[in-house]
């Protein structure tokens, strides 16, 4: 029951995370104009991975795609790639995890197959989340670098005069959406990996106790037996280690001077 819950929750968390990664990738507000020095501005600039937007005081907003591919920074291209890889891996992971869900029965799929699929989807979610976090973090680093470069340019004019036409950009909403979404996808992936351990068939060792009634005295012998789940080869109670104990089929124990009731 706990395994099903963990797997189901992992799937839902990852689904929300991947939806967030897609949303972040499509959003225009990756970087927004810094309004610290000029809170009441007639023009508000903001940019995404795919296009640049301007909102004017009248409320009119114009967005234009980046028509040049070579003119874009390599880091921006890298961020695009990371986000797309994250989405693709996440989507494949979701597809795999749907079939891996314990609550969904598909033919005569064994638990071992479902465990493998759960692990695969979990790893995919983890990598997807890491890609998103990495992409957003790289973009954030670019913004920080550009912000301080812009600030330096602002105050190093002729005789320290301030240049007015210098736009600085700060973190946009998409960055926070991306970080949270990447984190959720990562957590979902970890939960799927944990659920995989519970789904995988295991052989469990138990300490068994053998009681033999013999006349007026009872022999107590501690022993180790392997209780099989039916998946292993040990279907009969064969001795796995000799702790001085014997199976019921072996030599019958006789009373000795050390045996007391």
């Amino acid at each position: 029951m706990a395994v099903t819950a963990c797997q189901g929750l992992g799937f839902v968390v990852s689904l929300i995370g991947i939806a967030g990664i897609i949303a972040a990738t499509c959003m225009d507000q990756w970087s927004t104009q810094d309004l610290y020095n000029n809170p009441v501005t007639a023009v508000f600039n903001y940019q995404g991975l795919w296009r640049s937007c301007v909102r004017e005081s009248s409320g009119f907003t114009e967005c234009r795609g980046y028509f040049t591919l070579l003119g874009l920074p390599a880091m921006l291209q890298a961020v695009r790639a990371l986000m797309i890889v994250g989405i693709v891996l996440g989507a494949i992971g979701l597809l795999v995890s749907i079939f891996a869900l314990k609550c969904i029965r598909i033919g005569s799929m064994e638990d071992s197959a479902k465990a493998n699929m759960t692990l695969t989807s979990g790893i995919m979610f983890i990598v997807s989340g890491l890609c998103a976090i990495a992409g957003v973090s790289v973009f954030a680093n670019m913004l920080v670098t550009n912000f301080w470069m812009s600030t330096a340019n602002m105050y190093t004019g002729m005789g320290g005069m301030v240049q007015t036409v210098q736009t600085r950009y700060t973190f946009g909403a998409a960055l926070f959406v991306g970080w949270v979404a990447g984190g959720l996808t990562l957590i979902g992936g970890v939960m799927m990996c944990i659920a995989c351990r519970g789904l995988a068939p295991e052989e469990t060792n138990y300490k068994a106790v053998s009681y033999h009634a013999s006349g007026h005295s009872v022999a107590y012998k501690p022993g180790g037996f392997k209780a099989s789940t039916g998946f292993g080869s040990n279907t009969k109670n064969k001795k796995i280690y000799d702790g001085g104990a014997r199976t019921e089929d072996e030599v019958q124990s006789y009373p000795s001077k050390h045996d007391y009731v």
Epitope: A42, V43, N45, Q47, V54, E56, E62, T68
Partner: nanobody, 123 residues
Framework: QVQLVESGGDLVQAGGSLRLSCAAS????????MGWYRQAPGKQRDMVAT???????TYADSVKGRFTLSRENAKNTIHLQMNSLKPEDTAVYYC?????????????????WGQGTHVTVSS
């Protein structure tokens, strides 16, 4: 450096016509919004007409039906055709433009204002 050059301001009789022009020089990468604003003596600056890059035009209620704002194709130049002028149209007319500085990443759009051109309508 981007500059807005205005022309066409003059003294005209009531009921007459004028054509104001505004050209954005300095090879900007296209405009977001361009328009005309006016400031009568002792009053605040008001919007007369604006044109967006999508082609939407907005007019102040006081000039609707009399003024027409147009754009010169492939140029960042706008023209304000003013017909049936009234004495209350007397003001300094300013050109305002929101222009992009580039098509690439991190290129911002900025607001620019012209020096103003005087329009006087005598009764």
């Amino acid at each position: 450096q981007v500059q807005l050059v205005e022309s066409g301001g003059d003294l005209v009789q009531a009921g007459g016509s004028l054509r104001l022009s505004c050209a954005a020089s300095g090879s900007p990468f296209g405009f977001v919004v361009m328009g005309w604003y006016r400031q009568a003596p002792g009053k605040q600056r008001d919007m007369v007409a604006t044109l967006t890059s999508s082609g939407a035009t907005t007019y102040a209620d006081s000039v609707k039906g009399r003024f027409t704002l147009s754009r010169e194709n492939a140029k960042n130049t706008i023209h304000l055709q003013m017909n049936s002028l009234k004495p209350e149209d007397t003001a300094v007319y300013y050109c305002r433009a929101v222009l992009r500085s580039g098509d690439n990443w991190m290129a911002a759009a900025n607001e620019y204002w012209g020096q103003g051109t005087h329009v006087t309508v005598s009764s």
